[in-house]
Interface confidence: low
């Protein structure tokens, strides 16, 4: 580490004095200090002498000696005060530029350490500092404004109390620049626009940045539009707004609009699409099949997508029958918006009851007229089965009626013993009826089929079972003859 002679941290001299500063190191050494007149430099290998025989207040400052060849980069310093009764301040720079939130050093160096107790920082023309200005003072370096703000970009003077009066330094201009994080922030509204030919439209492109130096423009397809710009300063940001007002839109106004803003950091752009239509429109669609089948007791959500301009003036879900005259509860209907012109309407039908099968229609209205979309809801039921013994054309017949939806299939089983349900071990015979007679088949109702099994003689100690099944489930009815002869004759006419 180099060594400075005189070996004191500070040296105080009067104007006109001779000052000699000598630095000695292991290798060659160099001096660094404030730019000031009248210094003479003598270098001799490992030593360097800085001297003046006419010190002035401008020589006030810190002089540092370094050894360029030293890998540890050691240095030594001495601070020189040239205490001029007429000049308490040596200002090293008249303009200081920093970014916001950095510390700003205003380099007014005190020429006499004795004056430190009476120093202060003021704005020019004796104005006080702005509120919340946080600063500190060092006689070697000057005043530091901590975490400088853009609003503190002002002209400052350093003040010292000499003989009861305040003596000012020349002014120092502080420029606090905003840190520009990136290209300007952009908004383009609306994000999508639809208008009928002849209507008015407005597209607003706005950009904002912490710095005033940025450009913004609006382009239609690839044409840059000439629009007057409104400027504002709000919430510590500069805003530039371009508003395109179209009194009567036509088809040539349609297309892609891009809002583009740029600054030194780069460019941002955002786009929207403007559609011009001949007349109002209202389109209803569904991603679901309009014919729905649901098992009784389960729930279903019916969804309708609406594309409309102008906006809807009314909409509702309606039950068209054929059962009760109930209407869907409004609380089961919900509306959500994808964007300005597209909406989804949902009707929730929880725990469906038999009387809720039928047609559900969604109706919507806008200036383009009414539109409706109708769903047909059929409920699925597991089969219900019953068996009776009768005579048909003189023959003993088991008659099985099965009711359900979808249409049930019918299978007859004959098994040994008396049982509620035939199991595999007991089965003696199986008959499938591929074409049972359909007794009733109305829309939204159960399908009822009938199957006949002709039995000449009912076997005692046997069970005849009719089984019906469909995609929902199965049902069965076991017929147990009470006695072999009890049902061998036709009933009385």
């Amino acid at each position: 580490i180099p060594v400075i002679e005189p070996s004191v941290p500070e040296l105080v001299v009067k104007p006109g004095a001779t000052v000699t500063l000598r630095c000695v190191g292991n290798g060659s050494v160099e001096w660094d200090g404030p730019p000031s007149p009248h210094w003479t430099l003598y270098s001799d290998g490992s030593s360097s002498i800085l001297s003046t025989n006419n010190a002035t207040f401008q020589n006030t400052g810190t002089y540092r000696c370094t050894e360029p060849g030293d890998p540890l980069g050691g240095s030594a310093a001495i601070h020189l005060y040239v205490k001029d009764p007429a000049r308490p301040w040596n200002v090293l720079a008249q303009e200081v530029v920093v970014f916001e939130d950095q510390d700003a050093l205003l380099p007014c160096l005190l020429t006499d350490p004795v004056l430190e107790a009476g120093v202060s920082l003021v704005r020019v023309r004796g104005r006080p500092l702005m509120r919340h200005t946080n600063y500190s003072f060092s006689p070697w370096h000057g005043f530091t404004i901590h975490r400088a703000k853009f609003i503190q970009s002002q002209d400052y003077q350093c003040s010292a109390l000499m003989g009861g009066r305040k003596v000012m330094s020349i002014s120092i201009r502080l420029k606090v620049q905003k840190v520009i994080p990136g290209p300007p922030a952009l908004t383009l509204v609306p994000a999508e626009l639809v208008r009928i030919r002849g209507e008015a439209a407005q597209i607003v492109c706005s950009a904002s940045s912490v710095d005033v130096n940025f450009d913004v423009f609006l382009q239609h397809n690839n044409t840059k539009l000439a629009i007057p710009q409104q400027s504002d300063f709000h919430n510590n940001r500069y805003q530039k707004v371009l508003t395109l007002n179209l009194d009567q839109v036509d088809f040539q106004h349609a297309g892609n609009y891009s809002c583009v803003a740029s600054n030194v950091q780069g460019k941002h752009s955002t786009s929207m699409f403007f559609r011009v239509v001949e007349s109002a429109y209202l389109n209803l669609s569904s991603e679901q099949n309009l014919i729905q089948e649901v098992t009784v007791g389960e729930g279903l959500n019916l969804k309708v997508m609406v594309e409309a301009y102008p906006g809807l003036q009314g909409f509702n879900w309606t039950y068209l029958g054929p059962f009760s005259d109930h209407q869907p509860e409004p609380k089961l209907a919900n509306a959500t918006t994808k964007d300005t012109y597209r909406h989804t309407f949902t009707l929730s039908l929880p725990r469906l009851k038999p009387s809720e099968a039928g047609r559900y229609s969604f109706l919507a209205r806008n200036p383009g007229g009414w539109r409706a979309l109708t769903f047909e809801l059929t409920l699925r039921y597991p089969p219900e089965v019953s068996v009776i013994w009768t005579f048909i054309n003189g023959s003993g017949t088991l008659l099985c009626a099965a009711s359900g939806y979808p249409q049930p299939n019918v299978t007859w089983l004959q098994c040994s013993g008396h049982t509620d349900r035939c199991d595999e071990a007991q089965v003696l015979q199986v008959w499938d009826d591929p074409y049972p007679e359909v007794l009733s088949q109305e829309p939204f109702h159960k399908v009822t089929v009938q199957s006949l099994l002709t039995v000449e003689t009912l076997e005692h100690n046997q069970t005849y079972e009719c089984r019906a099944h469909n995609s929902v489930g199965s049902g069965s009815w076991a017929f147990i003859p009470i006695s072999a002869g009890a049902h061998t004759h036709p009933p009385d006419e």
Epitope: A200, V204, K331, A335, T337
Partner: antibody, heavy 124, light 109 residues
Framework: QVQLVESGGGLVRPGGSLRLSCAAS????????MSWVRQAPGKGLEWVSA????????NYADSVKGRFTISRDNAKNSLYLQMNSLRAEDTALYYC?????????????????WGQGTLVTVSS | QAGLTQPPSVSVAPGQTARITCGGN??????VHWYQQKPGQAPVLVVY???DRPSGIPERFSGSNSGNTATLTISRVEAGDEADYYC???????????FGGGTQLTVLQ
Amino acid sequence: QVQLVESGGGLVRPGGSLRLSCAASEFTFDDYAMSWVRQAPGKGLEWVSAISWNGGSTNYADSVKGRFTISRDNAKNSLYLQMNSLRAEDTALYYCASTVEVAHRRLYKYLEVWGQGTLVTVSS
Amino acid sequence: QAGLTQPPSVSVAPGQTARITCGGNNIGSKSVHWYQQKPGQAPVLVVYGDSDRPSGIPERFSGSNSGNTATLTISRVEAGDEADYYCQVWDISSDHVVFGGGTQLTVLQ
């Protein structure tokens, strides 16, 4: 500071007319739909009427439909409510409010900035 | 155009949590907004879109909405929170703004 200032209220006989005005400052007036809301003495808030940003669409509460007319002049940053055939039950403090219309996730509207109100008294 | 039901009054001690409800048929499918009105003053928006807060409104104010009830919650209640509170929705089918009847919040001293 965004500001809405209502004026035009006063004492009027039943069947009479009044025209309320609302002057807007410090915000982009024509970005917003606007509404009138009233509050009868000691009662709750009642929405009266709304108008879209460009005046192209208007809407009224059933209680005032056919008697009141809402309008705006964007060049003057002003909102108006023409009240005809006034009744005793129209006595209230009338507020104007900037109305934010949102079509995002859900459709909704809310009243963002309110004026201090102007008092309308209908009495014989 | 269904109405919104609010309790006429709610009382709470300072530092406690106040909950003001707003009932309505399937209100959870709509967006609910809340206003505070102090005596002699205009209403002020305190919560919009169920749970969003405008700038300048303390974090103590929060909202929720599901099913048939929306709730405005004021935590760590202060004397200055004493006011009338109104809920509001937009009825999409009529395009009308609908207010609840209002709730008077009293801060017990």
